[in-house]
Interface confidence: low
């Protein structure tokens, strides 16, 4: 009678992560008795993934009816693949015995796992930037399968072209990374612009991830000052305004000088929002000119998110 | 080590039918595109169709697209060509190639930079009646 | 669809010689390119990938470079072996899956 053989007709399999992997094992006689277990990897390291005897495997059960004194399909199906589950198979035959001993294995089966990218992760600078300076954002994803990825960075829906791209690791691995930076320029008109990150894989069936950063907690627009003199409200006063206009974020402190003594600090509140996202707002100042006796140099100071204050200053005259 | 073996080819009238076959050892063909290419006596190369078993994807070019059927066998680990309908022009040596990415990717085009690093020797198909 | 135009169509030149080949992307395409050398009966082989990337087991007298569209394969000095036919090829798609030919450049010693 012709040797026991085993027989694994699947060289490979490929599955996607969730789904169930079906490893087909046949042997060709009833003799020698004893039991199949299945492993993956080979040599002394092998991982046991079902023996037929004993053992609990939750994920794994038998393809036909392997109690049945007849039956040489020893096929399994292991449920909810995930990508640490890639790998070879190997169908091993055992003689029965005290203890049982190794008679024959498998050719083996591959099995490759397509998994979904990860949703990507887009991030910003850590601090802020101004109008016409470069920044850079990252855009992450990860736990794919296979390698095959296409990553693309769109600005308000324009395609960006600078930017570099890592597909982590470079060997096989049972899941892979992606990793890039772009560069983007920013504009005064960038408050409600978006920036994002486009990832294609087979597993998404083309409909990409995509992951998205606002520049509004990116860009800081500093602002213009203007300071003038209204025409007089009472006798002995004149309004001066300082109109600061088109910048952001909202935080903004302003100081009232009086030949260059403070006369009044204020934190922009009621502010007016432009179209473009970025705020303009007004301070007056109410000067007695008859408390002068020489002419006043009036200047209104702003700090803007914390960066160093600007100025802007205006001379009164003040008539004997 | 890397080969590929192309067989399958001869003599075949115009309206006839032939099958090539690509088997591939030395890796898992499960992991690569794998084309087809010919080049008709005297002339220079024309890719035909592609494939990745994988994932079932298919290509062809247009002088092909409805005639001929590529396939994959990945537990035989050899890809195929059907070839349908054929024509006096579609006489050429068949080669399969392997395609395979290095790892470097072209940001502003979103494609890997890859190319057919491994040939099969070829086969010769005539059409002619 | 992208065409690679390569010129010229053959070339006459001596042992030692500095070769210059050229392929023309009728659009903008990426550095997907590769060119291989075929001598008569035989199957292509690889020599440059990603336009400028030598091939193992290539001798370094073979490079490619990219300007724009125009791609090209410089043999630095001519060897007796060196004389055969020369194809570009681009990767059409992201992952390689359709890919386009040069018409060949004939190398024949002068």
């Known amino acids: 009678e012709e040797e026991l053989q085993v027989i694994q007709p699947d060289k490979s399999v490929s599955v996607a992560a969730g789904e169930s992997a079906i490893l087909h094992c046949t042997v060709t006689s009833l003799i020698p008795v004893g039991p199949i277990q299945w492993f993956r990897g080979a040599g002394p390291a092998r991982e046991l993934i079902y023996n037929q005897k004993e053992g609990h495997f939750p994920r794994v059960t038998t393809v036909s009816e392997s109690t049945k004194r007849e039956n040489m399909d020893f096929s399994i199906s292991i449920s909810n693949i995930t990508p640490a589950d890639a790998g070879t198979y190997y169908c091993v035959k055992f003689r029965k015995g005290s203890p049982d001993t190794e008679f024959k294995s498998g050719a083996g089966t591959e099995l490759s796992v397509r998994a979904k990218p990860s949703a990507p992760v887009v991030s910003g600078p850590a601090a802020r930037a101004t109008p016409q300076h470069t920044v850079s954002f990252t855009c992450e994803s990860h736990g794919f399968s296979p390698r095959d990825i296409t990553l693309k960075w769109f600005k308000n829906g324009n395609e960006l072209s600078d930017f570099q791209t890592n597909v982590d690791p470079v060997g096989e691995s049972v899941s892979y990374s992606i990793h890039s930076t772009a560069k983007v320029v920013l504009t005064r008109e960038d408050v409600h612009s978006q920036v994002i990150c486009e990832v294609a894989h087979v597993t998404l069936q083309g409909d990409p991830l995509r992951g998205t950063a606002n520049l509004s907690e990116t860009i800081r627009v500093p602002p213009t000052l203007e300071v003038t003199q209204q025409p007089v409200r009472a006798e002995n006063q004149v309004n001066v305004t300082c109109q600061v206009r088109k910048f952001y974020p909202q935080r903004l402190q302003l100081t009232w000088l009086e030949n260059g003594n403070v006369s009044r600090t204020e934190t922009a509140s009621t502010v007016t929002e432009n179209k473009d996202g970025t705020y303009n707002w007004m301070s007056w100042l109410l000067v007695n000119v008859s408390a002068h006796r020489d002419d006043v140099k009036l200047t209104c100071q702003v700090e803007h998110d914390g960066q160093p204050a600007v100025s802007k200053s205006h001379d009164l005259k003040v008539s004997a | 080590e890397v080969q590929l073996v192309e067989s399958g080819g001869g003599l075949v009238q115009p309206g006839g039918s032939l099958r090539l076959s690509c088997a591939a050892s030395g890796f898992n063909i499960s992991y690569y595109f794998i084309h087809w290419v010919r080049q008709a006596p005297g002339k220079g190369l024309e890719w035909v169709a592609s494939?990745?078993?994988?994932?079932?994807?298919?290509y062809y070019a247009d002088s092909v697209k409805g005639r001929f059927t590529i396939s994959a066998d990945t537990s035989k680990n050899t890809a195929y060509l059907q070839m349908n309908s054929l024509r006096a022009e579609d006489t050429a040596v068949y080669y399969c190639?392997?395609?395979?990415?290095?790892?470097?990717?072209?940001?502003?085009?979103?494609?890997?930079?890859?190319?057919?690093?491994?040939w099969g020797q070829g086969t010769l198909v005539t059409v002619s009646s | 669809d992208i065409q690679m135009t390569q010129s010229p169509s053959s070339l006459s030149a001596s042992v030692g010689d500095r070769v210059t080949i050229t392929c023309r992307a009728s659009?903008?395409?990426?550095?997907?390119v590769a060119w291989y050398q075929q001598k008569p009966g035989k199957a292509p082989k690889l020599l440059i990938y990603?336009?400028?990337s030598l091939y193992s087991g290539v001798p370094s007298r073979f490079s490619g470079s990219r300007s724009g569209t125009d791609f090209t394969l410089t043999i630095s000095s001519l060897q007796p072996e060196d004389f055969a036919t020369y194809y570009c090829?681009?990767?059409?798609?992201?992952?390689?899956?359709?890919?386009?030919f040069g018409q060949g450049t004939k190398v024949e010693i002068k």
């Open positions: 494939v990745y078993s994988s994932f079932g994807y298919t």
């Open positions: 990603s336009a400028s």
């Open positions: 659009q903008s395409v990426s550095s997907a």
């Open positions: 090829q681009q990767a059409v798609n992201w992952v390689g899956a359709l890919v386009t």
């Open positions: 190639a392997r395609f395979t990415f290095p790892g470097l990717f072209d940001g502003f085009f979103g494609a890997y930079l890859g190319s057919l690093d491994y």
